[in-house]
């Protein structure tokens, strides 16, 4: 994007790159020095964190934020009511539930309030933004002699969340990961009863009701089998 | 703390030229808009340019447009006013000035005097 | 161009007593943003100009709370409570809506 502009008196300047937000064509509109990028996460659908690096700021500065949903019931401009700071500058803001619409388009407004016209705005799919809580209440069922099955609960509507299971025993030295989908359950069919397993999962908001990338926290991790290998160099450092 | 310290003032010719400086210090330079103002002996307040914290925009006051370029040096710290083709409707005391935008000039140089005489 | 025109040029001042300086536009100086782009600045004898009020009515930091602002569109007002002998100087108010800036033509206040 190389922009001309043409000022209010007529004169012609060429502009380098930069997000031109729309401005009357009485007002100076030229290029200002950017402001953070805004980045916004939906916690379990229960609240989002909408985050800025406070710190890049040429000085300390209590930026605003505004937000909306385009083309929707909801387009009215809203003021953040809650903000979250670092070093007593704002550097995000908090939006409950209430205000949260995953399918709508998000846009989000970031202001200086010492110069309104430097402003930035963003516009955010929230579906794919989701960050589920961490998977819980791990249990292990025996479903044979050397058949294992791994279940888990998620906080959140399972058909909307993926799955990612490690595990690994006492003797390896990296873990085995496997893919899961919405039914929120794992078999492993060939389990050795000498080792020691630990098990852990984690979610993501993805692929049915949003393409979220960003996965959950780790579960717990969970254990099965035999924990008297004395010589096993991993043991210690799987259970920290 | 924020310093504005200016140079390159002096006695000049009519249609001569004249670089002025302005050195900056006690902030981050590459951050903020710059401008040049200019004051008349005994008259008011005139602006006369801007540049954007980058360089990639220029604005001047149409008393000056063509005969003066505002520019910048971020490594150098150092904002600058080459103007050509003086008058001596230019006689004035010229100061530099920080922005973080185009509003609200914060901080001032101490001004430097040019004198367009023959 | 937006022409500053300031009210009064010299204004007299007893110590302790208030004083108010107009300012008008020749257009409007309210952005879409909500804002108006109006600044004030005092230049004290000898020195540099010194940055007063931004936004019309934001103090710059430093700047006694007996200064405030006010006005919209194109009639604003910088008031002094209660002036003080260091409040001498000549006060400019100036636009930045639109290029070129543009100063009012100063207002001289002085102590009787």
């Known amino acids: 994007l190389n922009t001309t502009i043409l000022t209010p008196n007529g004169n012609e300047d060429t502009t380098a790159d930069f997000f031109l937000t729309t401005m009357p064509t009485d007002s100076l509109s030229v290029s200002t020095l950017p402001l953070p990028e805004v980045q916004c996460f939906v916690f379990n659908v229960e609240y989002m964190n909408c985050t800025w690096n406070s710190s890049s700021e040429p000085q300390p500065t209590n930026l605003t934020l505004h937000y909306w949903y385009k083309n929707s019931d909801n387009d009215k401009v809203q003021k953040c009511s809650h903000y979250l700071f670092s070093e007593e500058i704002t550097s995000g803001c908090q939006l409950q539930k209430k205000e949260i619409h995953l399918y709508q388009t998000f846009v989000v407004q970031l202001q200086d309030p010492r110069e309104p016209r430097r402003q930035a705005t963003q516009m955010l799919k929230l579906q794919n933004l989701v960050i589920p809580w961490a998977p819980e209440n791990l249990t292990l069922h025996k479903l044979s002699e050397s058949q294992l099955e791994l279940n888990w609960n998620n906080r959140f509507l399972n058909h909307c969340l993926e799955h990612l299971v490690q595990y690994r025993t006492d003797w390896d030295h990296s873990w085995t990961e496997q893919s899961v989908d919405y039914r929120h359950k794992f078999s492993l069919p060939s389990v050795d009863g000498q080792k020691r397993y630990t098990f852990r999962v984690r979610s993501r908001f993805n692929p049915l009701c949003g393409s979220a990338q960003h996965w959950s926290e780790w579960s717990h991790p969970i254990h099965w089998g035999s924990n008297t290998s004395k010589e096993n160099p991993f043991l210690f450092a799987l259970e920290a | 703390q924020v310093q504005l310290v200016q140079s390159g003032g002096g006695v000049v010719q009519p249609g001569r030229s004249l670089r002025l400086s302005c050195a900056a210090s006690?902030?981050?330079?590459?951050?903020?808009?710059m401008h040049w103002v200019r004051q008349a002996p005994g008259k008011g307040l005139e602006w006369v340019a801007v540049?954007?914290?980058?360089?990639?925009?220029?604005y001047y006051a149409d008393s000056v447009k063509g005969r003066f370029t505002i520019s910048r040096d971020n490594s150098k710290n150092t904002l600058y006013l080459q103007m050509n083709s003086l008058r001596a409707e230019d006689t004035a005391v010229y100061y530099c000035?920080?922005?973080?935008?185009?509003?609200?000039?914060?901080?001032w140089g101490q001004g430097t005097l040019v004198t367009v005489s023959s | 161009e937006i022409v500053m025109t300031q009210s009064p040029l010299s204004l007299p001042v007893t110590p302790g007593e208030p004083a108010s300086i107009s300012c008008r536009s020749s257009?409007?100086?309210?952005?879409?943003?909500?804002?108006?782009?109006l600044d004030w600045y005092l230049q004290k004898p000898g020195q540099s100009p010194q940055l007063l009020m931004y936004?019309?009515?934001n103090r710059a930091s430093g700047v006694p709370e007996r200064f405030s602002g006010s006005g919209s569109g194109t009639d604003f007002t910088l008031k002094i409570s209660r002036v003080e002998a260091e409040d001498v100087g000549v006060y400019y108010c100036?636009?930045?809506?639109?290029?070129?800036?543009?100063f009012g033509q100063g207002t001289k206040l002085e102590i009787k």
């Open positions: 006690g902030f981050t330079f590459s951050s903020y808009a």
């Open positions: 936004l019309v009515s």
């Open positions: 000035a920080r922005s973080l935008y185009y509003s609200h000039f914060d901080y």
């Open positions: 257009q409007s100086l309210l952005h879409s943003n909500g804002y108006n782009y």
């Open positions: 100036m636009q930045t809506l639109q290029t070129p800036l543009s």
């Open positions: 540049i954007s914290y980058d360089g990639s925009n220029k």
